[in-house]
């Protein structure tokens, strides 16, 4: 008789999840030799231990602490790039500007990027059929709690000038409900962070509006200013040219506004 299984609203665990996490860990420690001390089998064991045999709506940050400890990593605190709803461009940027880091350029972010996972209460099985959806089921699910935990730690580590890339094509350029708006903004440390600089990325080729005057950007400025952190904003009118100029800053066309 097949055992009854809870049906959640979200997609199930990414196929070959254990193998993917382990392989990514090994690859990361090769690409980043300063992390060669990391034992990837222990990392996987700690990752698994955070959600296996636990109710997938009852996960806490505490569950992830063993993994956080094993994945402890130092990134230059003044070279942090946050992003909201524009992940691909942020990652393209740090692939060129190699001394800057998004969360997904760290070991823990790299391990989990684009993956889904959850377990079941009282069984050691991984649920490949469905996992809780943040809105429809519960917010304390394994994936959401993981990203909340690592995002908080990443923001807490930031110092000096912190950059954030925002999507100017969205109705809410700054969204209070995004991970950036709900977690990272509130965990920047005013005693360490001097300025948050927003880069608003334009979508349309003929879009010459100053999106730094957008009401949601003004809202972000207000939140940041109340936290005693300075705020600045730049329009990136041509993201393609922006990336090209990061690659080749000597190019004569790169002196004009991008």
């Amino acid at each position: 008789v097949p055992r009854w299984r809870q049906q959640w609203s979200g997609p199930g665990t990414t196929k070959r999840f254990p193998e993917t996490v382990l392989a990514r860990c090994v690859k990361y420690t090769e690409i980043h030799p300063e992390m060669r001390h990391v034992d990837c089998q222990s990392v996987w064991d700690a990752f698994k231990g955070a959600f296996i045999s636990k109710h997938p709506c009852n996960i806490t940050e505490e569950d992830y602490q063993p993994l956080m400890k094993l994945g402890t990593q130092t990134v230059p605190c003044n070279k942090i790039l946050l992003w909201s709803r524009i992940k691909d461009l942020a990652h393209q940027f740090t692939q060129v500007q190699r001394d800057m880091f998004t969360l997904e350029d760290t070991l823990l972010g790299y391990l989990a990027d684009d993956l889904t996972w959850c377990g079941e209460f009282n069984t050691s099985k991984i649920n490949y059929q469905s996992c809780p959806d943040w809105r429809k089921d519960c917010s304390n699910n394994p994936v959401s709690v993981f990203w909340k935990t690592v995002s908080r730690r990443f923001a807490e580590a930031a110092c000096d000038v912190v950059h954030v890339m925002l999507n100017g094509s969205r109705s809410k350029i700054f969204d209070k409900n995004s991970t950036f708006g709900s977690v990272e903004v509130h965990n920047l440390q005013p005693e360490k962070v001097q300025t948050l600089e927003a880069w608003v990325i334009h979508g349309g080729r003929e879009d010459s509006r100053d999106l730094c005057q957008d009401p949601t950007i003004k809202e972000l400025e207000s939140i940041i200013s109340k936290r005693n952190i300075q705020f600045s904003c730049k329009n990136i009118y041509r993201p393609d040219k922006f990336l090209q100029c990061v690659k080749n800053p000597e190019d004569s066309s790169c002196t004009s506004e991008i």
Epitope: E30, I31, H32, P33, E34, R36, H37, T74, V75, P76, R98, D99
Partner: antibody, heavy 112, light 113 residues
Framework: VEESGGRLVTPGTPLTLTCTAS????????MSWVRQAPGKGLEWIGF?????ITYYASWARGRFTISKTSTAVDLKITSPTTEDTATYFC???????????WGPGTLVTVSS | AQVLTQTPSSVSAAVGGTVTINCQAS????????LSWFQQKSGQPPKLLIY???SLASGVPSRFSGSGSGTQFTLTISGVQSDDAASYYC?????????????FGGGTEVVVK
């Protein structure tokens, strides 16, 4: 760990040094190359990872090539100059330092 | 590029005395503690003494100790013995994607009287 291949070469003549390891597997460790000119200090050239990804000092890029087989790690000096005269060391890179196990070194002399 | 500056370049000590060697990095080493010390005697390869700023490598006498953080590090030899006459090198580690992975200091020669 033992280096070999060091000899007298004329400027511009490519030279390959070989590092052989015994008692451990090269697939389990990063391996580093370091050199020391006569009477001078240690200079890190580069290393090769477990899966053969290479990293070089900024000054060494283009001047050296590191490669490996299952039994040895090679350092190719692409176009030696007299400034490349040095003892070349191969070292096993451990988790937290540039090397916990070093070979005795092999001397390369570049002279016309 | 990052630079590790060792001082002094040469130091003389009596048997039983104390030697202090400083190493200053032009930027913080990885994790503020990824700094090692090597001993090299004439005609020999370097030997790892200390890793991660203060951890003693296997078989190294406890008279060797390391301290520091970030950009400033110190190697101390307490109760110097004649066998300690050698050159000493600090070695820092940095994030490879944006800098040289490893950098050595210029060395300090220790002479034991």
């Amino acid at each position: 760990v033992e280096e070999s291949g060091g000899r007298l070469v004329t400027p511009g003549t490519p030279l390959t040094l070989t590092c052989t390891a015994s008692g451990f597997s090269l697939s389990s460790y990063y391996m580093s190359w370091v050199r020391q000119a006569p009477g001078k200090g240690l200079e890190w050239i580069g290393f090769i990872s477990k899966t053969a990804i290479t990293y070089y000092a900024s000054w060494a890029r283009g001047r050296f090539t590191i490669s490996k087989t299952s039994t040895a790690v090679d350092l190719k000096i692409t176009s030696p100059t007299t400034e490349d005269t040095a003892t070349y060391f191969c070292a096993r890179v451990d988790a937290y330092s540039a090397g916990d196990l070093w070979g005795p070194g092999t001397l390369v002399t570049v002279s016309s | 590029a990052q630079v590790l500056t060792q001082t002094p370049s040469s130091v003389s000590a009596a048997v039983g005395g104390t030697v202090t060697i400083n190493c200053q990095a032009s930027q913080s080493v990885y994790s503020d503690n990824r700094l090692s010390w090597f001993q090299q005697k004439s005609g020999q390869p370097p030997k790892l003494l200390i890793y991660s700023t203060s951890s003693l490598a296997s078989g190294v006498p406890s008279r060797f100790s390391g301290s520091g953080s970030g950009t400033q590090f110190t190697l101390t030899i307490s109760g110097v013995q004649s066998d300690d006459a050698a050159s000493y090198y600090c070695q820092g580690e940095f994030i490879c994607t944006s800098a040289d992975c490893f950098v050595f200091g210029g060395g300090t020669e220790v002479v034991v009287k």
